[in-house]
C-alpha cells in the first residue's frame, strides 16, 4: 500500500506565439481545479477507460478575475498535493491523465458551471520511495508544470511497496534470513507468509498468516464469490458458505464514484453525484463535448452540444490520436526519395534534395548536364546526380576552365625532361631511352626492346610513341 502524490507548480500559457485567452473574465470570474487519473502499465488507454490505480480531485483554487487587456498569466492554483492512495503493489510503470478544470462563478442558473480547460497524458516509469520527478506537459497553448512521486505507507517498503518492515525484536540484528529494511535500518524485513491456501488471485495479506479478500470475494481463503441473493439484507449476516457480504462496510466505503463524484447512501445501494462532463452509475462515463475543448494542437472539434453527442477532432498535419494529442514522426515513413534529407516542420514536410534531384519528394532526376557547359572544348559526362567534365588536352578543373600544366605530374620516365606544348607535352629522353614517355630502354647494339607492334602498325612507325 502507498500513496501517489502530485504537486502542480504552474498552469499558464506555454512558450511561443498564440498565447491563449484568459479562461476567466471580470464578467465571469472563475477558479481552477485539477483531476488526476492513474492506470497501471504503459497502456495507450482512452481517457474514458477506468482509472484502475485511482483518481483524485484537488481543492478549488483562488478565485481569479482577468485584468482587461492583460495576457493570461500563470493562473492561481489550489493549495496542497493531489494524493491517490493505492492499496496493492505499486506497478512501477503507469499512465496518467491530468485534467485542468475551470469552475465559472458568474450568475449561473443552477449553480457553477465546469468545463475542461486542458488535458495532458503520459506514460512513465517510477519506483516507489524515489525522489520527486519533475515534468512539463503542453496541451494546445497551455503549459502545465508538475512533480510527482510514489511513496509507501508503513509498514510497506521497497520500489513496489510489497516488502513489510517490523521493529527489531533484538537490538543488535535481524532474525535468521531477514535483512534490515533500508532506509529504516532499525527495522527488519518481515517474512510475509499468508494463511495456507489463501487464494493468490483474490486474497492478500498484510500480516503473516492472514488472508484478506479483494472486493467481490469472501470466505476464509477468499475463494467464494460474493452474492447478496441469499442474504437477509444487503448488509446482512455472513458466512463462508453463503458468501454473503460481511456486515459493516457501507456502500459508499472506498468511494465507488469515479472522476471526483460524491457518493451518498440510498436505502438499497448508493448514488453518485457526478461533476459536469461525467455521468453513469459511478460517474465512469465521460460526457465530454466540444464545449470542453478536448482537441489539442490546433485540432478542430466537430460535435453537438448535448452531453450524449459524440465528438471528433479534425487534426492538423503532424498530429494524430482521438484528441490530436500525438505528434506524428512523418519522417519515419522516409518520404524523401533518392537520398533526400527529411525535415518535419510541424505545419509541413520538407525534403532537402541531393545535387541532381528535385521535386517536393526529390522524385525528379535532373539532367545533370542540362545548363552545364564545359569550357575549352570539354564534354559533359552525367553520373549519380552530379556532372563532371572530361576536359580537352591542356585543360582541367571542374568545368575545364583551368589551364593544366601537363608536366606537373612528371610524366617523363628515366630522367627525361618535360616540355609543355600546345598539343600536350613532349619528353626529351635521356641517353639510352626512347618512347613518348621515355619508357623504353635502347639496347647498346642499336636494337630496341619495343614490344611487338599491334596489327596495322609497323615497328618504327612514329604514331607508336605519340
Amino acid at each position: 500500500a502507498g500513496v501517489f502524490e502530485l504537486q502542480i507548480h504552474s498552469f499558464g500559457p506555454g512558450p511561443g506565439p498564440g498565447a491563449p485567452r484568459s479562461p476567466c473574465s471580470a464578467r465571469l470570474p472563475c477558479r481552477l481545479f485539477f483531476r488526476v487519473c492513474l492506470k497501471p502499465g504503459l497502456s495507450e488507454e482512452a481517457a474514458e477507460s477506468p482509472c484502475a490505480l485511482g483518481a483524485a480531485l484537488s481543492a478549488r483554487g483562488p478565485v481569479y478575475t482577468e485584468q482587461p487587456g492583460a495576457p493570461a498569466p500563470d493562473l492561481p492554483l489550489p493549495d496542497g498535493l493531489l494524493q491517490v492512495p493505492f492499496r496493492d503493489a505499486w506497478p512501477g510503470t503507469f499512465s496518467f491523465i491530468i485534467e485542468t478544470w475551470r469552475e465559472e462563478l458568474g450568475d449561473q442558473i443552477g449553480g457553477p458551471a465546469w468545463s475542461l480547460l486542458a488535458r495532458v497524458a503520459g506514460r512513465r516509469r517510477l519506483a516507489a520511495g524515489g525522489p520527486w520527478a519533475r515534468d512539463i506537459q503542453r496541451a494546445g497553448a497551455w503549459e502545465l508544470r508538475f512533480s510527482y512521486r510514489a511513496r509507501c505507507e508503513p509498514p510497506a517498503v521497497g520500489t513496489a511497496c510489497t516488502r513489510l518492515c517490523r521493529p527489531r525484536s533484538a537490538p543488535s540484528r535481524c532474525g535468521p534470513g531477514l535483512r534490515p529494511c533500508a532506509p529504516l535500518e532499525d527495522e527488519c524485513e518481515a517474512p510475509l507468509v499468508c494463511r495456507a491456501g489463501c487464494s493468490p488471485e483474490h486474497g492478500f495479506c498484510e500480516q503473516p498468516g492472514e488472508c484478506r479478500c479483494l472486493e467481490g470475494w469472501t470466505g476464509p481463503l477468499c475463494t467464494v464469490p460474493v452474492s447478496t441473493s441469499s442474504c437477509l439484507s444487503p448488509r446482512g449476516p455472513s458466512s463462508a458458505t453463503t458468501g454473503c457480504l460481511v456486515p459493516g462496510p457501507g456502500p459508499c466505503d472506498g468511494n465507488p464514484c469515479a472522476n471526483g463524484g460524491s457518493c451518498s447512501e440510498t436505502p438499497r445501494s448508493f448514488e453518485c453525484t457526478c461533476p459536469r462532463g461525467f455521468y453513469g452509475l459511478r460517474c465512469e462515463v465521460s460526457g465530454v463535448t466540444c464545449a470542453d475543448g478536448p482537441c489539442f494542437n490546433g485540432g478542430l472539434c466537430v460535435g453537438g452540444a448535448d452531453p450524449d453527442s459524440a465528438y471528433i477532432c479534425h487534426c492538423p498535419p503532424g498530429f494524430q490520436g482521438s484528441n490530436c494529442e500525438k505528434r506524428v514522426d512523418r519522417c519515419s515513413l522516409q518520404p524523401c526519395r533518392n537520398g533526400g534529407l527529411c525535415l518535419d516542420l510541424g505545419h509541413a514536410l520538407r525534403c532537402r534534395c541531393r545535387a541532381g534531384f528535385a521535386g517536393p519528394r526529390c522524385e525528379h532526376d535532373l539532367d545533370d548536364c542540362a545548363g552545364r557547359a564545359c569550357a575549352n572544348g570539354g564534354t559533359c559526362v552525367e553520373g549519380g546526380g552530379a556532372h563532371r567534365c572530361s576536359c580537352a588536352l591542356g585543360f582541367g578543373g571542374r568545368d575545364c576552365r583551368e589551364r593544366a600544366d601537363p608536366c606537373a605530374a612528371r610524366p617523363c620516365a628515366h630522367g627525361g625532361r618535360c616540355y609543355a606544348h600546345f598539343s600536350g607535352l613532349v619528353c626529351a629522353c635521356a641517353p639510352g631511352y626512347m618512347g613518348a614517355r621515355c619508357e623504353f630502354p635502347v639496347h647498346p647494339d642499336g636494337a630496341s626492346a619495343l614490344p611487338a607492334a599491334p596489327p596495322g602498325l609497323r615497328p618504327g612507325d612514329p604514331q607508336r610513341y605519340l
Partner: nanobody, 115 residues
Framework: EVQLVESGGGEVQPGGSLRLSCGPS????????VGWWRQAPGKQRNLVAG???????NYAQSVKGRFTISRDNAKNTLYLQMSSLRAEDTAVYYC?????????WGQGTLVTVKP
C-alpha cells in the same frame, strides 16, 4: 454548392437493423473528417458517430455497441450500420464531411423505429 446524398433510411421495428449510405461523392472522403448526425423532432442536431481525418472513431454514448461507422475510400462512400434499433433512434440522419476550410452536409434521410 456540393451536397452529399444519403440513402438507406426507412421504417423499421424495434430491434431491427438498417444500413445508411452516403455517396459516392465528388468530395474525397479519405482526407476529411466524416460523420453521421441526427436530429429528432424538437431536439438539437447531434453527432451520432464520426471518423476523424486521422482515423479515430467515436460514438455517442447512446449508440455505442449498436451502431458502426465505416468508410470505403476506394468507393468514396460513408456507411452507418445500425442494429438493435430503439424508438429513441427515430430521427433524420445527416451525412457530414469537413476539412479545415469547408464542411459539407447531406439533405438527410428519415429513420423511423416503431412497433
Amino acid at each position: 454548392e456540393v451536397q452529399l446524398v444519403e440513402s438507406g433510411g426507412g421504417e423499421v421495428q424495434p430491434g431491427g437493423s438498417l444500413r445508411l449510405s452516403c455517396g459516392p461523392s465528388e468530395i474525397i472522403f479519405s482526407d476529411k473528417s466524416v460523420g453521421w448526425w441526427r436530429q429528432a423532432p424538437g431536439k438539437q442536431r447531434n453527432l451520432v458517430a464520426g471518423i476523424s481525418n486521422v482515423g479515430s472513431t467515436n460514438y455517442a454514448q447512446s449508440v455505442k455497441g449498436r451502431f458502426t461507422i465505416s468508410r470505403d475510400n476506394a468507393k468514396n462512400t460513408l456507411y452507418l450500420q445500425m442494429s438493435s434499433l430503439r424508438a429513441e433512434d427515430t430521427a433524420v440522419y445527416y451525412c457530414y464531411a469537413r476539412d479545415f476550410e469547408n464542411e459539407y452536409w447531406g439533405q438527410g434521410t428519415l429513420v423511423t423505429v416503431k412497433p
